[in-house]
């Protein structure tokens, strides 16, 4: 048995006569042989579920579900209840109605075995019938909505009449009907005004019925029509077995460059026309088990269940359904030497499904784990300016497919052919498993015998110690020119183009800072600034070389304060700035200010 609504509403007036009928509550059957029996909770409740008083005023007919006044609710009774309402004005009280067979404790009131009946209290007597508007004569203030379980025996779930109005205003004639399309499973009995289902409903065919209730009021010669929505929601039960969309029960996958723990290797989709169990229960009741195979597979893979609600078309309307994605996921980082092929089976069980048929499916994953060989190009050739400053980025080294790697930890090292010409350093970038080559020793750059720098690049997989090697030849170009006196260590200090371009700074490949002219569009990512190399700084990312010294690119790397119009970077630096941004790394400060219209040079010329 279950209630067709979880809440009912009616009005209560002071001194309403004992015996006044208030409303009917309705229960629907889960099985044909069930007979409902109603009982009221012992207490009346007020605002914020405050228990006000034992219910001495309202009774229920156990077999019919009719609620009526057992005794009149006078002013003194009302005040007694109001005092207990934690100081709030008492505008609404509610009662709990239980279906007798269910032994729910008074404290809990959960649909389907319990419903709440709310009474709006009016501190006046019942109004004169002639003063009631048609809307008040026809329907309660709060529009009802109904819930009916699918596949259950048909039954009565609503009664249209407002019983106090019918009781106190017998001369007003009120008629009801349901507007509904052809073939809908509802009927409104013209005599009793009871609404019932004609047959058991199937949610997978239709989930929502947006009916309209029409009320016609006859008062003397006057006839008025009132229409209100009459929504019915069909509640789901687990009556559909899981299936494979388009019959696809097998997924094949190759694990090669993406070897990181939590990588999704393959996905298989299961469709279920049901939307139960509900999300809270779903993973517990809709189980997936990786069937025992070899231990390696059990340790290496796991299956993740990702249910999602979807909607499908049925008989011209959309109904909800569930798609279950079963993802085969790496449980650990896989070594580059792993080389296996296996078939994994996953048992999916819709444990609430009662049949006919089985609620069990078998998913198949064919997985090939390929080994990864580390290869470097045979030779790298680069050039570097003799004027390059320390931390200038001059190139990248990268094992074959390194951009595609994840879960593979490759470290790069440089072996210089001689210590006196050991100019470059290499750091491994976590983002793309490449090695960034940078100037580490500017003194060596200036030695005449170091016109050509010979290195061996050694790439080592940290897990297996497998290596790849390549020769790196760096040609040193240009001649060294000493820097202007008084230039700052960081390019970012310069606020104007002129002073920017006549100095060098840490990270500058040419020995000169570069000016980046912004687009001038308010707070923008493309703000004006002075940089060691606009290729790498600022780019919204504090790279592995820039982390070596805050003076290289404070625009990307500063953790200090930024003054002026800006958007901070995540987790550091300036994501966007207003006008020109310059920085003072030692003070851990950056300033973003409107561009100066006049250059000092212009001032001189104007004089």
């Amino acid at each position: 048995l279950y209630f067709s609504r979880d809440a009912y509403w009616e009005k209560l007036y002071v001194d309403q006569a004992a015996g006044t009928p208030l409303l009917y509550v309705h229960a629907l059957r889960d099985a044909p042989e069930e007979v409902p029996s109603f009982r009221l909770g012992q207490h009346l409740y007020g605002t914020y579920r405050t228990r006000l008083h034992e219910n001495n005023w309202i009774c229920i007919q156990e077999d019919t579900g009719l609620l009526y006044l057992n005794r009149s609710l006078d002013h003194s009774s009302w005040e007694k209840l109001s005092v207990r309402n934690r100081g709030f004005p008492l505008l609404t009280v509610y009662l709990k109605v239980f279906l007798s067979p269910t032994s729910l404790r008074e404290g809990e009131c959960q649909w389907p075995g319990c419903a709440r009946v709310y009474f709006s209290f009016f501190n006046t007597s019942f109004p004169a019938c002639s003063s009631l508007k048609p809307r008040e004569l026809c329907f309660p203030e709060t529009r009802p909505s109904f819930r009916i379980r699918e596949n259950r025996p048909p039954g009565t779930f609503h009664q249209f009449r407002l019983l106090p109005v019918q009781f106190l205003c017998p001369n007003i004639s009120v008629a009801y009907r349901l507007l509904e399309g052809e073939g809908l499973p509802f009927r409104c009995a013209p005599d009793s005004l009871e609404v019932s289902t004609r047959w058991a409903l199937d949610r997978e065919q239709r989930e929502k019925y947006e009916l309209v209730a029409v009320c016609t009021v006859h008062a003397g010669a006057r006839e008025e029509v009132v229409m209100v929505p009459f929504p019915v929601t069909v509640y789901d039960e687990d009556d559909s077995a899981p299936t494979f969309p388009a019959g696809v029960d097998t997924a094949s996958a190759v694990v090669e460059f993406k070897r990181k723990e939590d990588t999704v290797v393959a996905t298989l989709r299961v469709f279920d026309a049901d939307v139960v169990p509900a999300s809270g229960e779903l993973v517990r009741r809709y189980t997936s088990t990786l069937l025992p195979g070899d231990t390696w597979a059990q340790q290496t893979f796991r299956v993740e269940h990702w249910p999602n609600e979807t909607s499908v078309q049925a008989n011209g309307s959309f109904v909800r359904a569930t798609v279950h994605d079963y993802r085969l996921v790496l449980n650990r980082n896989l070594s580059i030497s792993e080389n296996r092929t296996m078939q994994l089976a996953v048992l999916v069980n819709d444990s609430d499904f009662q049949g006919p048929g089985a609620g069990v499916l078998l998913l198949h994953f064919n997985v090939s784990v390929l080994p990864v060989s580390l290869h470097l190009p045979s030779t790298y050739s680069l050039s570097v300016s003799r004027r390059a400053r320390r931390f200038a980025q001059i190139g990248k080294v990268c094992v074959e497919n390194c951009q595609a790697f994840s879960g593979i930890n490759v470290q790069y090292k440089l072996h210089s052919s001689g210590a006196n010409c050991s100019t470059l350093g290499v750091v491994t970038s976590a983002e793309d498993t490449s090695g960034i080559l940078f100037v580490n020793d500017t003194k060596a750059l200036r030695r005449p015998k170091c016109a050509e720098l010979h290195y061996m690049v050694v790439a080592t997989d940290q897990q297996t110690s497998r290596q790849a090697q390549a020769q790196l030849l760096v040609t040193v170009e240009g001649s060294y020119v000493a820097e202007e006196a008084g230039c700052p260590l960081s390019c970012a200090v310069s606020k104007r183009r002129l002073e920017c371009e006549e100095c060098g700074g840490l990270g500058s490949p040419t020995g000169r800072c570069e000016w980046r002219q912004g687009d001038g569009k308010g707070i923008t990512r493309n703000f004006s600034t002075c940089s060691p190399s606009t290729k790498t700084c600022p780019d919204g990312h504090c790279d592995v070389v820039e982390t070596q010294d805050i003076n290289i690119c404070p625009q990307d790397c500063l953790r200090g304060s930024i003054v002026g119009g800006h958007e901070p970077g995540e987790p550091r630096g300036i994501k966007a700035g207003y006008g020109t941004c310059n920085c003072f790394p030692e003070e851990e400060k950056c300033f973003c200010e409107p561009e100066d219209i006049q250059d000092p040079l212009c001032d001189e010329l104007c004089r």
Epitope: S381, H415, S417, H454
Partner: antibody
Framework: EVQLVESGPGLVKPSETLSLTCTVS?????????WNWIRQPPGKGLEWIGY???????SYNPSLKSRVTISRDTSKNQFSLKLSSVTAADTAVYYC???????????WGQGTLVTVSS | DIQMTQSPSSLSASVGDRVTITCRAS??????LAWYQQKPGKANKLLIS???TLQSGVPSRFSGSGSGTDFTLTISSLQPEDFATYYC?????????FGQGTKVEIK
Amino acid sequence: EVQLVESGPGLVKPSETLSLTCTVSGYSITSDYVWNWIRQPPGKGLEWIGYIHYSGGTSYNPSLKSRVTISRDTSKNQFSLKLSSVTAADTAVYYCARGNYDWAFAYWGQGTLVTVSS
Amino acid sequence: DIQMTQSPSSLSASVGDRVTITCRASKSISKYLAWYQQKPGKANKLLISSGSTLQSGVPSRFSGSGSGTDFTLTISSLQPEDFATYYCQQHNEYPWTFGQGTKVEIK
């Protein structure tokens, strides 16, 4: 003047490990350059085996990599070669040599003949 | 690996002759080729590196030329002490590889 002298057993049994040492005088192996092992089978050409860098890093010829280990003893200014699971094909004169700034081999030892035979 | 092919494998010449040995690489090695002299009972000697750079202490009668794949060692006037085996070696690409040698004998 840099001098390199190879030493080690002249006869090694098949499947055993060949071990040679190169003693360097006149230059510290931790100061600079790469320190190499090269071999020459009787009547054949030269084959580079691998090196140990002044920093301690190593690099090996891929064709021998699975069997080779080059290490050093800085206190004695020596570097060593170990070649495991030897066969008759590993019979050769083994040279140690110092690399140049362009990877060419500027200084060589006299070489030592190692015969693999039971 | 880069294959190095020397020719001829041996040659006979007289003192004072001009001798040319060629070395061909299986792919371009830029200018990075070294030449060595090997004599029995003596340590091998680096003559030329980077194609044409004469090492200190090496007589000027030795010269190297070429780039890409084709290289030449020339001894302008053969001396008695030059009778030996000569090897080329590419030092452009890992792993470094040698030619099979050219033996220069007395005619």
